[in-house]
Amino acid sequence: EPPTACSDKQYLHDGQCCSLCQPGQKLVSDCTEFTETECLPCGESEFLDTWNRETHCHQHKYCDPNLGLRVQQKGTSETDTICTCEEGWHCTSEACESCVLHRSCSPGFGVKQIATGVSDTICEPCPVGFFSNVSSAFEKCHPWTSCETKDLVVQQAGTNKTDVVCGPQDRLR
């Protein structure tokens, strides 16, 4: 009796279980009762990343420098090219088809996580006792200056955007 189902690395063709082509190869001809599935390696700049019965290999992704992209990992016959963004930029999606400039954290906010080629800067508001007075993609919130350790007193309270202002202690006359 002809099979109705085949194993995970086979496919049903004309009532017969044929071997799938291995990753990196494409289908040239289906198996018969006398010959196995005929497969051929993908060409330069092509790939197939699964056991398959595809008659054409996929083209490697092009990392377009005009979109701020560059090659992070060159593709093989079994894997696609992985793109990333130039320094200071990050991908707009998981597929990394285009790039945008890293976000800067405004005054009053510090960098919680520095951006990578695939993720944007993550900012956090500076909590009490910390400040940031610049717009930056790298600067964290800085702690207020400790006037006491300098034998000074606070003359002007700090905010999330400004440091405290220290001054000399008042002398008894």
């Epitope: 009796e1 002809p2 018969t32 009762e33 006398f34 010959t35 196995e36 005929e38 497969c39």
Partner: antibody, heavy 117, light 107 residues
């Protein structure tokens, strides 16, 4: 016990025809693909033709395509090879063989076909 | 069609010898290769299928290896009944094709 017995060989003139038969026994004939393989005197083996178990698929070597026809009668457990427009280079011992998962596991004893004027 | 080339074409050896016959395909055939033995006046007999699997009833002194384009049939210790002609046959691409044969003779 699996047995394959070829018959129908003989002397034929160039351009003539011949039909070979292969009687099968000892297995469920309709479940197996079958083939014909030939061997010219003092030469190597040449795959000639094959047929699927249900007769749905047939295949031929380029050297015989259009001249030879493979067929089977599952009710009679018999494989056939109709050979037309025979040439001197078709002279050979013709073997029928049972196919099992891409290999020929049982062979007949062969029948000699001589094409000569 | 895929061309199968066997070497050597003929080989003289003695009982007890270790013998290797090679078969080369004109393009990659993965492990889609069978080996047959044929004695004069007899039908071929299957020895090895899928490059390295021993057919039931065949002595374990016969072994096959290889993949891609290069394959070998090895007889570890020749016995008198092993003197015959050996053929490789590919099934990686239609039509199936045989090598030209290797004749193993007594030295």
């Amino acid at each position: 016990e699996v047995q394959l017995l070829e018959s129908g060989g003989g002397l034929v003139q160039p351009g003539g025809s011949l039909r070979l038969s292969c009687a099968a026994s000892g297995f469920t004939f309709s479940s197996y693909a079958m083939s014909w393989v030939r061997q010219a005197p003092g030469k190597g083996l040449e795959w000639v033709s094959g047929i699927g178990g249900s007769s749905s698929y047939t295949s031929y070597a380029d050297s015989v395509k259009g001249r030879f026809t493979i067929s089977r009668d599952n009710s009679k457990n018999t494989l056939y090879l109709q050979m037309n427009s025979l040439r001197a280079e078709d002279t050979a011992v013709y073997y029928c063989a049972r196919y099992y998962s891409y290999h020929m596991d049982y062979w007949g004893q062969g029948t000699l076909v001589t094409v000569s004027s | 069609d895929i061309q199968m080339t066997q070497s050597p074409s003929s080989l003289s050896a003695s009982v007890g010898d270790h013998v290797t016959i090679t078969c080369r395909a004109s393009q990659s055939i993965s492990s889609y290769l069978n080996w047959y033995q044929q004695k004069p006046g007899k039908a071929p007999k299957l020895l090895i299928y899928a490059a390295s699997s021993l057919q039931s009833g065949v002595p374990s002194r016969f072994s096959g290896s290889g993949s891609g384009t290069d394959f070998t049939l090895t007889i570890s210790s020749l016995q008198p009944e092993d003197f015959a002609t050996y053929y490789c046959q590919q099934y990686g691409s239609a039509p199936p094709t045989f090598g030209q044969g290797t004749k193993l003779e007594i030295k």
